[in-house]
Interface confidence: low
């Protein structure tokens, strides 16, 4: 269904004559008759199979025709059709002189014809006007035409019916070709399927209206991408529903057993280092100057032997005091009152006098240090070994003894603890800074997933239609997570098919 539209623009009849050559009196009061029919190689008289239309008198002799011209006529002229547009046509436009007001064919003299044009050809459906100009000996007609589809009809031939809708049967408008264009938030062949909230998990979430995200059993969160852990799980997480994978430092089926007392309770005082040594037990390594189980007791400051060169330490209320041996002075007896005459430099050190011989300085050979070159150089004082490696002096050089999991000259390289596949029963291994951690599959626990914790209720594959099975550890039963289109405790029932459509 569509409309052939003809827009008359300008008619020129400068001499104001009829087709016979006879002049109009007083001028040619011009109206038009239009005949639209099927394609004919030679346009001949006969029925106007696609329709006819006439105009009122539009002007005299030569005139321009305005859009929606006055006098009751319409410009463009409309020739509606109720069939598939064939793509070809024949068009006859006759210009007639109306001596009076009666424009009926039988009321006009036979020689009232001013001009007649006939064209035929191909014409595709479209919004663009085709411009044309037809000239005869005495007249010229300028016009344009096009074919457009009626409301709700689309496609190259106006044969596709499409009505926009926004209800249970679909949510769409129609594209120029008649295909459906879904309204925002809808998808699917008939735009019946809502588009869920952006990011809503494809398998674990669903929606019944746009921008919604409803979670399937075992899942939670705005986007249904957070699993629900085992009921009663205290300090654990899950990667699939009903799991309870313990956080670091926690153990047991419900991750409620504290394996990391140090982190959770910080029992060591005064900057001491805490080490876990079993469930709810720990050891504090105190900093110098402190003692006690939790390093809560302050030691005498003299216990750290602050006085050098054989000086003796005495406690004071707010610190300590060094008593220096003969030839030394200073807060820690670090300065000498000897001179080079006393040969104070040991281990081959050379003596240099200072302050006119009042004191001296020793220049030490390699591998010796101290104000009197009395100390052998300890190459480990700078603590060059990384990752807790132990530094060992070996003659003129040094070496690092590395902790398990580290290698390299300075223990700077991390050896993957996971390389030897330590996790049993398909557990997933994670390298940590201080070792490794196993994430166990459902039904297993322990540091290496070596402990079977429950019967695997999913082992018998009880779920139908490719549903995902999860074991509920608290009851040793299973839960089936159904794919889209299926319901039931085992996903055995298909959801009813969508109703058929009325077009």
């Amino acid at each position: 269904s569509g409309v052939f539209q003809l827009q008359l623009q300008e008619f020129i009849n400068e001499r104001g004559v009829l087709a016979s050559g006879r002049p109009c009196e007083p001028g040619c009061r011009t109206f038009f008759r239009v005949c639209l029919k099927h394609f004919q190689a030679v346009v001949s008289p006969g029925p106007c199979t696609f329709g006819t239309v006439s105009t009122p008198v539009l002007g005299t002799n030569s005139f321009a025709v305005r859009d929606d011209s006055s006098g009751g006529g319409r410009n463009p002229l409309q020739l509606p059709f109720n069939f598939t547009w064939p793509g070809t046509f024949s068009l006859i436009i006759e210009a007639w002189h109306a001596p009076g007001d009666d424009l009926r064919p039988e009321a006009l003299p036979p020689d009232a014809l001013i001009s007649k044009i006939a064209i035929q050809g191909s014409l595709a459906v479209g919004q663009n006007w085709l411009l044309d100009e037809q000239t005869s000996t005495l007249t010229r007609l300028r016009y344009s035409y096009r074919v457009i589809c009626s409301d709700n009809y689309y496609g190259d031939n106006c044969s596709r019916l499409c009505k926009k809708r926004n209800d249970h049967f679909g949510h769409y408008v129609c594209q120029p070709d008649g295909n459906l264009s879904c309204l925002p938030g809808w998808t699917g062949e008939y735009c019946q399927q809502p588009i869920c909230l952006s990011g809503c998990h494809e398998q674990n979430g669903y929606c019944s209206k746009p921008a919604e995200c409803l979670c399937r059993p075992g899942w939670q969160g705005r986007l249904c991408n957070e699993c629900i852990p085992h009921n009663g799980c205290r300090h654990g997480t899950c990667s699939t529903p009903w799991q309870c994978t313990c956080d670091e430092g926690w153990g047991g089926l419900f991750c409620d057993q504290d394996l990391n007392y140090c982190t959770h309770h910080s029992p060591c005082k005064n900057g001491a280092t805490c080490s876990n040594s079993g469930q709810r037990s720990y050891t504090c390594t105190c900093r110098p100057g402190y003692t006690g189980v939790d390093c809560e007791l302050e030691l005498s400051e003299c216990d750290s032997n602050p006085c050098r060169n054989g000086g003796s330490c005495k406690d004071q209320e707010d610190g300590y005091h060094c008593l220096c041996p003969p030839g030394y002075y200073g807060l820690h007896c670090e300065h000498s009152t000897l001179s080079c005459a006393d040969s104070p430099c040991f281990n081959g050190g050379s003596c240099r006098e200072r302050n006119q011989g009042a004191n001296y300085a020793c220049e030490c050979p390699p591998n010796f240090t101290g104000s009197n070159c009395e100390k052998k150089v300890d190459r480990c004082t700078s603590n060059p070994c990384a990752n807790g490696g132990q530094c060992l002096n070996r003659g003129p050089s040094r070496m690092c003894r590395c902790r398990p999991g580290f290698t390299g000259t300075y223990c700077e390289l991390h050896v993957s603890d996971c390389a030897r596949n330590p996790c049993a029963h398909g557990g997933t291994c994670h390298d940590l800074e201080n070792g490794l951690m196993c994430t166990c599959p459902a039904g297993f626990s322990g540091r290496r997933c070596e402990v079977r914790t429950s019967i695997d209720a999913c082992a018998s594959s009880p779920c139908f239609n490719r549903a995902t099975c999860y074991t509920d550890l608290s009851t040793d039963t299973f839960v089936c997570n159904c794919p889209y289109g299926f319901v039931g405790s085992r996903c055995e029932f298909p959801v009813g098919l969508p109703p058929s459509f009325p077009w």
Epitope: Q9, S62, A64, D67, N128, W129, L130, L131, D132, E133, S144
Partner: antibody, heavy 122, light 108 residues
Framework: QVQLVQSGAEVKKPGASVKVSCKAS????????MHWVRQAPGQGLEWMGI????????SYAQKFQGRVTMTRDTSTSTVYMELSSLRSEDTAVYYC???????????????WGQGTLVTVSS | EIVLTQSPATLSLSPGERATLSCRAS??????LAWYQQKPGQAPRLLIY???NRATGIPARFSGSGSGTDFTLTISSLEPEDFAVYYC??????????FGQGTKVEIK
Amino acid sequence: QVQLVQSGAEVKKPGASVKVSCKASGYTFTSYYMHWVRQAPGQGLEWMGIINPSGGSTSYAQKFQGRVTMTRDTSTSTVYMELSSLRSEDTAVYYCAREEYASSSAEYFQHWGQGTLVTVSS
Amino acid sequence: EIVLTQSPATLSLSPGERATLSCRASQSVSSYLAWYQQKPGQAPRLLIYDASNRATGIPARFSGSGSGTDFTLTISSLEPEDFAVYYCQQRSNWPPWTFGQGTKVEIK
């Protein structure tokens, strides 16, 4: 938006020909007639002719009949105006102008090219 | 062909004054007449079509009147940017489309 972009200035000798182009964009090229209008230095506007880009049909002012040729290339949405047997009085700015066919201002010129100066000098 | 005659050839006015330009046709053009403004180095700009209709984006100070053979373009209060050459053009009888010879509005 509608744009008409013309070719650059030309200097020609008497007796030669010149071909000026006008590239259209921003609308359906074949739906609007195109006109050429020229303006000699310090003078008024002079209509030269019209071309129907849809079929290529033309109509020229009597004054230029036989000397002017208007053509179009629908693949590039471009119209051309060629003027031959140039004389010094053809020195002018040549404009293409789109007829406002699909609006109420039919057969007036709402959109113009920027103009092309053609100088005819020996 | 229809000849359009514009008067005066030059109009010397000050900003804020009212400008009245005339265009006379050698025969009736009904109301099929337009007015254009042209500034040096620029293409003409359509101001008024069909004798009295303002084109898109044209300020209200520009108005057109007349029918048949006598037409007037009025600029109610001249702005500095209105000093230019103004042409009338008919589309009643064509070809050719014809223009008037122009009226120059200059600053007094």
